[in-house]
């Protein structure tokens, strides 16, 4: 059940999560989908210029239900999903133009989940059974990384110490996490 | 039901190096977040370093920190940490744990690393 | 970042209830992230016990039980038994890939 393309508000398909790994069971198809763009944080990375402020790294709002078993999250929660794609800032394409992928021709540069948070769900589930409060991870921010080999697995390298977009108000809170493909603890394991 | 194995431990000389690999059976592997956790001997536990699902997001205590590396292959069910320049103070029992709603309701039986020459 | 800290030991008579408590200090959190207590008999790996501050795992005795307090998570278990005589661990999540943070540990020693 790999979801290979969706659409975004912007109508065009983005065939990006075709590369990602099958979501977590309790992960629903989206709801709503819409592009951010990465709110001109710089990745560090080096492609072709010494100017990493040109460089971006796409950022997808993700809106899902949580699912436990047969339990299913009251409201939607919303995430970012990171784009598969690290590129110039200006042909990483808008919500309204076109613009054209960019891809190196060195190394595969990856955006990839950066920053986590986590958030308390309220899960409702059928039968009359209690309402289950669950904290879940929920993607924060990403980040541009390097893709490279070690022992046979795949393994990001960080571009540079920079990374995470600042959150305006406050620190994102400590915990939670996911990948490409997005997140929510799987199955109850209780 | 889940089960968590660790292996790979021993006996390594300082600066030496070693690879863990923990077996997952009885859940949805590619689902869930891993963690290794080590405890020092007489010691409290410390977390050493988790994976997100599908292995493009690893994080670190500083104290391992570009000498340890964390890695997954969710066709296989397995999760591995590799352990580069070790040192006498990374001698511990090393547990490799599920992450569920962010607390860990799963761990292995935990595997000796002893760093000595 | 985080840190937690729980007393070095507690004890207790059998059928006593006993609290250990976890207090967080932070730069930046005024109170301390959702709270899991672990147990470890001497050799075995931890058990988890509590979650989310109060939520038992199925399986776990309901003599223990969870509260948070402002910046103070306790552990409470009531009708202490020679069983329950094992290290008690909290732990909260902190940092961009919201990764564990452990207290220093309690050993319960059942008089």
């Known amino acids: 059940q790999g979801w290979q393309a969706f659409k975004n508000d912007a109508t065009e398909i983005i065939p990006e999560l075709g590369e990602y790994p099958e979501p977590p069971p309790e992960l629903e198809n989206n709801k709503t989908m819409n592009r951010a763009e990465n709110g001109g944080r710089p990745p560090h990375h080096p492609f072709e210029t010494k100017d990493v402020s040109e460089y971006s790294c796409r950022e997808l709002h993700f809106t899902r239900y949580v699912t436990d078993g047969p339990c299913r999250s009251a409201k939607p929660v919303t995430e970012l999903v990171c784009s598969g794609q690290c590129g110039p800032a200006r042909l990483l394409p808008n919500a309204i133009g076109r613009g054209k992928w960019w891809r190196p021709s060195g190394p595969d540069f990856r955006c990839i989940p950066d920053r986590y948070r986590a958030q308390r769900v309220q899960l409702l589930c059928p039968g009359g059974e209690a309402p289950r409060a669950r904290k879940v991870r929920l993607v924060a921010s990403c980040k541009c990384k390097r893709l490279t080999r070690f022992h046979n697995q795949s393994e990001l390298k960080d571009f540079g110490t920079e990374a995470a977009r600042p959150q305006k108000g406050r620190k994102p809170r400590p915990r939670a996490r996911s990948a490409k493909a997005n997140q929510a603890e799987l199955e109850n394991a209780y | 039901q889940v089960q968590l194995v660790e292996s790979g431990g021993g006996l390594v000389q300082p600066g030496g190096s070693l690879r863990l690999s923990c077996a997952a059976s009885?859940?949805?592997?590619?689902?869930?977040?891993l963690s290794w956790v080590r405890q020092a001997p007489g010691k409290g536990l410390e977390w050493v370093s988790n994976i997100n699902y599908d292995g493009s997001s690893t994080y670190y205590a500083d104290s391992v920190k570009g000498r340890f590396t964390i890695s997954r292959d969710n066709s296989k069910n397995t999760l591995y940490l590799q352990m580069n320049s070790l040192r006498a103070e990374d001698t511990a029992v090393y547990y490799c744990?599920?992450?569920?709603?962010?607390?860990?309701?799963?761990w292995g039986q935990g595997t000796l690393v002893t760093v000595s020459s | 970042d985080i840190a937690l800290t729980q007393p070095a030991s507690v004890s207790g008579s059998p059928g006593q209830s006993i609290t250990i408590s976890c207090t967080g200090t932070?730069?930046?959190?005024?109170?301390?992230?959702?709270v899991s207590w672990y147990q470890q008999h001497p050799g075995k790996a931890p058990k988890l016990m509590i979650y989310d501050v109060n939520n038992r795992p199925s399986g776990v005795s309901n003599r223990f039980s969870g509260s948070k307090s402002g910046n103070t998570a306790s552990l409470t278990i009531s009708g202490l038994q020679a069983e329950d005589e094992a290290d008690y661990y909290c732990s909260t999540y902190d940092g961009p890939g919201l990764s564990e943070v452990f207290g220093g540990g309690t050993k319960l020693t059942v008089l």
């Open positions: 932070s730069s930046d959190v005024g109170d301390i992230n959702d």
């Open positions: 744990a599920r992450d569920t709603y962010l607390h860990f309701d799963y």
């Open positions: 009885g859940f949805t592997f590619r689902s869930h977040w």
